[in-house]
């Protein structure tokens, strides 16, 4: 299915416009910002949503910028150039001409320059650390059903195979999740790591994404398991290009 | 030829215990889940659990309240079942049912399951 | 705890003819529902997943509908060979679930 046919809405993205105007009647829905037909089957790609989010009112909930923690993007939220497939252009640029090369998950992985950079490939992110840390608890977490629950809300919530979450680091307070999606990994149809990192961190900020479904509660054998801050690192097949200089800043 | 095959079933004592195999052939173990579903003459089919062999992540019915736990020995591409103080209730055939690799949870590939009867 | 309620639990077809099953989700589980087929001594056999989606080798006779907490199970054409137990399974999670399977539904074939 394309949308939920009865009321014709996007289970997996809110940020959407939907209309039985499909083949045969059928519900279609069309991210905001960007006007594409999305998959409601599975996740919007992380660029579309950035769009979309740029796009809503400026009093809208969902802009509430990252915490200075979330490292998502240290350059805070642009509104990106998305290629048809609805992914990242390697090269994106502001609208005072400032340019600069982003990999995957649309993170700046070169100095900023004007026009004239050349980005030659959308660098992919194939190693995703997220840090979190949860708030106090009578006890620390058992860590085979903490990583067990981590798991099944990967695949369940966020549709994303077990094998490419890698690992679930757990020392109280912290918990880290390693996930892991090479190139030659991701099949068709598989739910890219960055995508569903992204979905990850607004669920966990108290910003979900999915239509109707209710917010992340997440529960460890029933203790709610509440988290208080949120670090995401990203790895690219091929290291990022800064300066010395901001290498040493 | 992918397969699986249940093993170990047979009479047991009210309040007994028994633990069942499932030997996997023909496919990588670790690229699966696999459940336990059991079924009780003549009554419909009753999941009891769940377990994901790579990670050895297990996930369990609510009614089995720890009285039944799941495991594998994934260089032998085998799953378990132990099952304890068992009742009559128990009595029924257990099948393997493996996942279609896929993150949803349907079971493509079952073996022909194993008669346990729980009776004195 | 998602609850699988299957109706009707027996009914009868005639050769060459078409029944419905029914099976209702107790609360949303958007297209993640699978049906089975199974006959007397043999393990259950996936027939549809995704709501709507024939498994390998499963004859085009059988057909599957509905998103949400609504679902059906339309088999046409009905032949001797179909006479089985149907069941519905929710594919959506395995957490905190106490039986993702329903009741079951007899088909008899006369």
């Known amino acids: 299915h394309t949308a939920a046919q009865d009321n014709c809405t996007c289970p997996t993205n809110k940020m959407t416009v939907c209309s039985p105007d499909g083949p045969g009647g059928r519900c279609q829905c069309r991210a905001l910002g960007s006007g594409m037909a999305v998959d409601c089957s599975t996740l919007t790609s992380k660029c579309l949503l950035l769009k979309a989010r740029m796009s809503a009112p400026k009093n809208a909930r969902t802009l509430v910028r990252p915490s200075e923690h979330a490292l998502v993007d240290n350059d805070g939220l642009y509104d990106p150039d998305c290629d048809p497939e609805g992914r990242f252009k390697a090269r994106q640029c502001n609208q005072t001409s400032v340019c600069w090369c982003v990999n995957s998950v649309g993170v700046r992985r070169t100095d900023k320059g004007d026009l004239s950079l050349r980005c030659d490939e959308l660098v992919r992110t194939h190693h995703i650390l997220i840090d979190l840390r949860h708030r106090p608890t009578a006890g620390a977490f058992n860590h085979s059903d903490l990583d067990a629950e981590l798991r099944r809300l990967f695949r369940e919530r966020y549709r994303l195979h077990p094998k490419f979450v890698a690992a679930v680091h757990y020392e109280q307070p912290t918990i880290q999740i390693e996930l892991r999606q090479n190139t030659s990994q991701k099949a068709a149809g598989d739910v890219d790591i960055g995508d569903a990192a992204y979905y990850f961190e607004r669920d966990i900020k108290g910003e979900s994404l999915f239509q109707g479904r209710g917010g992340l509660d997440l529960r460890v054998r029933g203790e709610p398991l509440q988290v208080e801050r949120t670090l995401i690192y990203y790895l690219d097949e091929i290291p990022p290009k800064f300066s010395m200089k901001r290498l040493t800043a | 030829q992918e397969q699986l095959k249940e093993s170990g079933g047979g009479l047991v004592q009210p309040g007994g215990s028994l633990t069942l195999s499932c030997k996997a052939s023909g496919f990588d173990f670790n690229n699966y889940g696999v459940s336990w579903v059991r079924q009780a003459p003549g009554k419909g089919l009753e999941w009891i659990g769940y377990i994901y062999p790579a990670y050895h992540n297990t996930y369990y019915a609510t009614w089995v309240n720890g009285r039944f736990t799941i495991s594998s020995h994934n260089a032998q591409n085998t799953l378990y079942l132990q099952l304890n103080t068992l009742t009559a209730a128990d009595t029924a055939t257990y099948f393997c049912?493996?996942?279609?690799?896929?993150?949803?949870?349907?079971?493509?590939?079952w073996g022909p399951g194993t008669l346990v009867t729980v009776s004195s | 705890d998602v609850v699988m309620t299957q109706t009707p639990a027996s009914v009868e077809v005639a050769v060459g003819g078409t029944v419905t099953i029914k099976c209702q989700a107790s609360e949303d589980i958007e297209s993640y529902l699978a049906w089975y087929q199974q006959k007397p001594g043999q393990p259950p056999k996936l027939l549809i997943y995704?709501?709507?989606k024939l498994a390998s080798g499963v004859s085009s006779r059988f057909s599957g509908g509905g998103y949400g907490t609504e679902f059906t199970l339309t088999i046409s054409g009905v032949e001797c060979a179909d006479a089985a137990t149907y069941y519905c399974?929710?594919?959506?999670?395995?957490?905190?679930?106490?039986?993702?399977f329903g009741g079951g539904s007899e088909v008899v074939v006369k």
């Open positions: 399974q929710q594919a959506l999670t395995v957490g905190n679930v106490d039986n993702p």
């Open positions: 049912a493996r996942d279609t690799g896929s993150t949803d949870y349907n079971f493509n590939l």
């Open positions: 995704e709501a709507s």
